[in-house]
């Protein structure tokens, strides 16, 4: 969480951002909030990116003002106009690109004053893993698959019964480049699986951590998946 304060002749206002991550090819949100102001026509929201000459986005007098927008963001940005009234200046970024990563500044002007805060935006690919029993294998085998990751993640297996055990000798992980030549499909196979146990396939890079659990008993198979973005720090 980053909290910024204004620094000019006018009063300063508090602006708060949250570091976040974008999943390439999908839409992302750059979070920013500020002290709401009753005089809506005075509210100006500017999004800037370090190293980019033009603006990422500008909203003033109740509408988008995109004449100064940088080419790389053309047609890809929007603020939530209905939420500006409650102090939400968050930016929606469509079709996130790898090159969108960097330091952004959320700069706010209201009738009460000015303020800004920076935001670190990471980009990559992350997806939920699915763990299945591989019935084609000669022994009891689990197969963990996740369709899109970047940068290349690490894959670690764990089990509820053998807590702390190292499964690297009885597992095999491969990374297959997807058709867009950036993201990769992750496939990890775990051998010599015992029944009545819960196994977890944990996939992690510097952007996200995802876990796929599978519980195999004689009567049923239960699955659960969970994905968590890392470094969501507010400022």
């Amino acid at each position: 969480l980053i909290i910024g304060f204004g620094i000019s002749g006018r009063h300063s206002i508090t602006v708060t951002t949250v570091a976040s991550a974008g999943n390439i090819g999908e839409d992302g949100i750059l979070s920013c909030t500020f002290e709401p102001d009753i005089k809506l026509s005075d509210i100006v929201i500017q999004w800037l990116k370090e190293g980019v000459l033009g603006l990422v986005h500008e909203f003033k007098e109740g509408k988008d003002e995109l004449s100064e927008q940088d080419e790389m963001f053309r047609g890809r940005t929007a603020v939530f106009a209905d939420q500006v009234i409650v102090g939400n200046a968050s930016l929606r970024l469509k079709n996130v690109q790898l090159t969108d990563a960097g330091t952004y500044k959320c700069y706010i002007i209201t009738s009460k004053g000015k303020g800004n805060a920076n935001l670190e935006y990471k980009t990559g690919a992350f997806s939920m893993p699915e763990v299945n029993v591989d019935y084609n294998a000669s022994s009891e085998t689990l197969r963990c698959e996740a369709p899109r990751w970047f940068p290349q993640p690490t894959v670690v297996w764990a089990s509820q019964v053998d807590q702390g055990a190292n499964f690297s000798e009885v597992s095999n992980t491969s990374f297959e480049l997807n058709s867009e030549n950036v993201t990769m499909k992750v496939v990890s196979v775990l051998y010599n699986v015992t029944i009545n146990n819960t196994y977890s396939c944990m996939i992690e890079n510097d952007i996200a951590k995802a876990t796929g659990d599978i519980k195999v008993t004689e009567s049923e198979i239960k699955r659960r998946s969970h994905l968590q973005l890392l470094n969501s720090k507010a400022s």
Partner: antibody, heavy 116, light 107 residues
């Protein structure tokens, strides 16, 4: 000095509609949101809806969805609130107010009585 | 939808004494909270916004505090004109919900 002047008291039949006006003076009308807040006899304040002329958007409380319509005429600096399918429990004082997000100026209120 | 609650429902205080009115939100509203005063037969009046900022013309005996979900309006030395109903209101999210109010009456 900002002033919000509302239309006069009304008596309405159940099932009919009401339309209350609110004329603003003393500041740029479209620079602010205008909200409607009602107060039933002996009860608290209830936010109904808000319009943001500068954004061209309106918001209603879920409770009034489909029954309330708010409009704003920038040329006359007047906001309107129409409530349809009136029932006895809509008997209240209806206030127009400048805002959100919070409300710094209020109209004098319009008493609407719904009775057969 | 955020639910606002206020306590007590009625507060009896003597003139010159201090009064503390409580407001609670069902989830965090950050600093997006306002207080209003309403006297019988009159429209409400904005007292405080942004938890602690007094509106224009509001005397400094009115003070707001708190953050997140718990808020307090303190009136340091009650004057006869301070009696009436007090409402808190959140503006973190649409819809703009008011609390049920606290009636401040003369003891």
């Amino acid at each position: 000095q900002v002033q919000l002047v509302q239309s006069g008291a009304e008596v309405k039949k159940p099932g009919s509609s009401m339309k209350v006006s609110c004329k603003a003076s003393g500041d740029t009308f479209s620079s602010y949101a205008i909200s409607w807040v009602r107060q039933a006899p002996g009860q608290g304040l209830e936010w109904m809806a808000g319009i943001i002329p500068v954004f061209g958007t309106a918001h209603n409380a879920q409770k009034f969805q489909g029954r309330v319509t708010i409009t704003a005429d920038k040329s006359t600096s007047t906001a309107y609130m129409e409530l349809s399918s009136l029932r006895s429990e809509d008997t209240a004082v209806y206030y127009c107010t400048r805002g959100g997000p919070y409300f710094d100026y209020w109209g004098q209120g319009t008493l609407v009585t719904v009775s057969s | 939808e955020i639910v606002m609650t206020q306590s007590p429902a009625t507060l009896s205080v003597s003139p010159g004494e201090r009064a503390a009115l409580s407001c609670r939100a069902s989830q965090s509203v950050s600093s997006n909270l306002a207080w209003y005063q309403q006297k019988p037969g009159q429209a409400p009046r904005l007292l405080i916004y942004g938890v602690s900022t007094r509106a224009t013309g509001i005397p400094d005996r009115f003070n707001g505090s708190g953050s997140g979900t718990e808020f307090t309006l303190t009136i340091s030395s009650l004057q006869s004109e301070d009696f009436g109903a007090y409402y808190c209101q959140q503006y973190k999210k649409w819809p703009f919900i008011f609390g049920p109010g606290t009636k401040l009456e003369i003891k």
